[in-house]
Interface confidence: low
């Protein structure tokens, strides 16, 4: 028979719980063995004080009786041949040599019937308290403090944990979070991150990803200061934060045992979300401008927002919806989170600038407004926070109230009269089509463009195919040639300030068709951009290439 107890001495801390195991091997008799625990105090090393027994409820000596009755000291059977002695709250006088004795059930006396282990009780010298975290976060002078951090900003909390135990022990420190105002216990406290006694850092399940991404950090600064930094605070990070320090010692058998644990409340943390703060206003009020005039609109992003930088970023854009159109409309221009501007579809060729003119004020400038720019403008701001690593996550967006913009029409009225010079034209000859344009209204410097189009008959009917461009002269005076039905040479020219000519050389039967002239009026603004201020279409001109009597 052999009775096994842990190798000693064991060091434990006053006020904490201790468990000492005992098991018996090589015995005869029933499978369920009985166990008796005794204590030999240092001041009376020969006196065995009965603590507790699995066999006799009256076994306990007076010094242990009340604690055994209260359940503070108990023997707990693990199996027939193994028990554990449990003392809930160690007292200094619990120090001494503990003996686990197994009454004999053997036919003859053989081996050992008890095992001894020394327990030394250390004073409770573990200290845990909140440490100033450093400069981040607003802190009210309360205890524990209330802290407010902006979504996306760093949350930094510090903890002081120290012990002056005379033996060689290690501290494990962890930071936990509980729902605001909830009672704190192991069930309600969710571990955020901890530093084990071997200095390895571990995170609680919901935080592991953030730890791996470098968004959650825990470090030891100096001998007793621990600092946790949660980068990119989220709404779910609000709560009461605690610091728990556990003191560990290595028992003689090489295993580690926790001998003390203390917890301190660090702070009640509120996370101010960007969505609750972001606000966008626009100015000046309703705008009425003339065509070609610059249009400037200002957008102000307000609210208790963190500055753009390591933790937060902003993008600002302008949207325009034509008068009466539903929805926010289409993008005009925007500045991305890096401050790089871009124009929306349909605005690429325009002289439009989007710029930041103050820390939170953005200006949209259309160098030369057009009637088509009239409508309702809104400024759209988006706030982003840096998620894992450097990735940006959209946290909030807000639109301004609509700002109406009116652009006066140019009031250009065009009329076009077209005809075939000579009235009759024969195959092989040149057909000259003339177009006279009249203009009413419009600004000085108005330029005209005119294009010529043809619709061809098929089986005597005008085809359903859209009209084809034959050629034209643009507002810049540059000729553009399309497709001539007969495939021969075409020339287009300006023969007067308001008169355009189309010539179809060496006329063939394929050139037969109904032609028209389509003038358009263009205005060039100070930014060199063009816009169409008016257009018209002449009546039809029929071209029928006649044949001479002897033509075949």
């Amino acid at each position: 028979r052999e009775v096994l107890v842990p190798e000693g001495p064991l060091y434990r801390v006053a006020g904490t719980a201790v468990s000492i195991s005992c098991n018996v091997t090589g015995y005869e008799g029933p499978a369920q063995q009985n166990f008796e625990w005794f204590l030999y105090r240092p001041e009376a090393p020969d006196t065995a004080l009965g603590i507790v027994s699995t066999k006799d409820t009256q076994f306990s000596y007076a010094v242990f009786k009340s604690r055994v009755v209260a359940g503070e000291v108990q023997v707990q059977r693990l199996q027939g041949d193994a028990v554990v002695l449990k003392i809930a709250r160690l007292q200094a006088q619990d120090a001494g040599i503990y003996e686990c004795h197994t009454p004999s059930t053997d036919t003859r006396y053989l081996g050992s019937y008890s095992g001894k282990v020394e327990l030394r009780v250390l004073p409770d010298v573990l200290q845990v308290s909140a440490a100033p975290p450093g400069p981040r976060g607003r802190q009210a002078p309360t205890s524990p403090p209330r802290m407010t951090v902006h979504e996306g900003q760093e949350l930094a909390l510090g903890c002081l944990a120290r012990t002056s135990t005379q033996k060689h022990t290690h501290l494990a420190v962890s930071f936990g979070r509980s729902v605001p105002e909830a009672p704190v216990g192991r069930s309600t406290l969710q571990e955020v991150v901890g530093i084990r006694s071997d200095l390895a850092v571990e995170a609680g399940a919901p935080y592991a990803e953030r730890l791996a991404a470098g968004e959650l950090r825990l470090g030891k600064e100096g001998t007793d200061r621990y600092r946790m930094v949660v980068g990119g605070a989220q709404a779910g990070d609000a709560g009461t934060y605690h610091c728990t320090a556990a003191e560990w010692i290595q028992d003689p058998d090489g295993s580690w045992a926790q001998i003390a644990e203390k917890r301190a409340v660090l702070a009640h943390v509120d996370v101010q979300t960007l969505s609750s703060q972001l606000a966008v206003t626009v100015g000046p009020g309703e705008r009425r401008i003339g065509p070609g005039e610059p249009l400037e609109l200002l957008c102000n992003v307000s609210g208790a927002l963190p500055p753009a930088g390591r933790h937060a970023a902003y993008s600002v854009g302008w949207e325009m919806a034509p008068a009466g159109a539903p929805g926010p409309g289409r993008l005009v221009a925007q500045l991305d989170t890096e401050g790089v501007g871009s124009l929306g579809p349909g605005y690429e060729g325009r002289h439009i600038a989007m710029e930041k003119v103050a820390s939170r004020t953005y200006r949209l400038r259309l160098e030369a407004a057009r009637p088509g720019d009239a409508g309702t403008y809104r400024c759209l701001a988006k706030a982003y926070v840096r998620g894992s690593g450097t990735r940006l996550r959209e946290a909030a967006s807000a639109r301004s109230r609509p700002l109406p913009v009116h652009v006066r029409e140019e009031g250009v009225v065009l009329e076009a009269v077209a005809w075939l010079a000579g009235g009759t034209v024969y195959r092989g000859e040149t057909a000259s089509l003339l177009c006279n344009i009249s203009v009413r209204g419009g600004p000085p410097g108005l330029r005209l463009a005119a294009s010529w189009w043809v619709e061809r008959p098929e089986d005597g009917e005008l085809s359903s195919v859209p009209a084809q461009l034959v050629g034209g002269v643009g507002q810049d005076g540059v000729a553009e040639l399309g497709v001539r039905p007969g495939g021969g040479p075409v020339s287009v020219e300006l023969v007067g300030p308001r008169s355009h000519r189309l010539r179809l050389h060496s006329l063939g039967p394929e050139d037969e068709g109904v032609y028209h002239c389509a003038p358009s009026a263009w205005v060039q603004h100070a930014d060199y951009s063009w816009y169409q201020a008016g257009s018209a279409r002449s009546g039809p001109v029929t071209v029928y290439p006649y044949m001479h009597a002897l033509d075949t």
């Epitope: 610059p294 002289h351 439009i352 600038a353 400038r365 160098e367 330029r447 100070a526 930014d527 060199y528």
Partner: antibody
């Protein structure tokens, strides 16, 4: 009084760089397109570059494209011409002038490119 | 690019003479034409813009005409201070281009 005043000219070796400035006063600078025009000794006028009032668009003569850069700082009422990879044929008096019809001219600044 | 051809390249005239300088554009520029006067050692000075509009402060003896491709600068009665070099310039499209200049000398 409406005025344009150029500066920054001087002697530079071929391949070198110069930056010309034109300080404007007496008018709303940001409302006007601006140009640089040069005149080689004993020769006629040659338009070099132009820029819109906002600075949003820039235009260059083929002879300087890729070597010269026009810019403006409307907050300082100043027009600039950054000239790189200078050649002997860039030797000229450089004038800054206002608008498309060049209605106001500076007194000019001399740029000499010579080894 | 639009070429501007000025003629004559030089002329001699006397005080009181009527002087005409012509300028031709290689393509239609409508009325986007200006005339400048330059004296030796001085910057050019705008005389006429939009082909026929007189710049403020310029004497009325200077006049401009033309449209499309052909333009004329006329000095109705030449004065001593008018002996200088005259340039035409189009502003219809970039690059802006100047004529080669006409030098008006004392006969």
């Amino acid at each position: 009084e409406v005025q344009l005043l150029e500066s920054g000219g001087g002697l530079v070796q071929p391949g070198g760089s110069l930056r010309l400035s034109c300080a404007a006063s007496g008018f709303t600078f940001s409302s006007y397109a601006m140009s640089w025009v040069r005149q080689a000794p004993g020769k006629g006028l040659e338009w070099v570059s132009g820029i819109t009032g906002s600075g949003g668009s820039t235009y260059y003569a083929d002879s300087v494209k890729g070597r010269f850069t026009i810019s403006r700082d409307n907050s300082k009422n100043t027009l600039y011409l950054q000239m790189n990879s200078l050649r002997a044929e860039d030797t000229a008096i450089y004038y800054c002038a206002r608008g498309g019809a060049l209605d106001i001219w500076g007194q000019g600044t001399m740029v000499t490119v010579s080894s | 690019d639009i070429q501007m051809t000025q003629s004559p390249s030089s002329l001699s005239a006397s005080v009181g003479d009527r002087v005409t300088i012509t300028c031709r554009a290689s393509q239609v520029i409508h009325n986007y034409l200006a005339w400048y006067k330059q004296k030796p050692g001085q910057a050019p000075k705008l005389l006429i813009y939009s082909a026929s509009s007189l710049q403020s402060g310029v004497p009325s003896r200077f006049s401009g005409s033309g449209s499309g491709t052909d333009f004329t600068l006329t000095i109705s009665s030449l004065q001593p201070e008018d002996f200088a070099t005259y340039y035409c310039q189009q502003s219809y499209s970039t690059p802006l281009t100047f004529g080669g200049g006409t030098k008006v000398e004392i006969k």
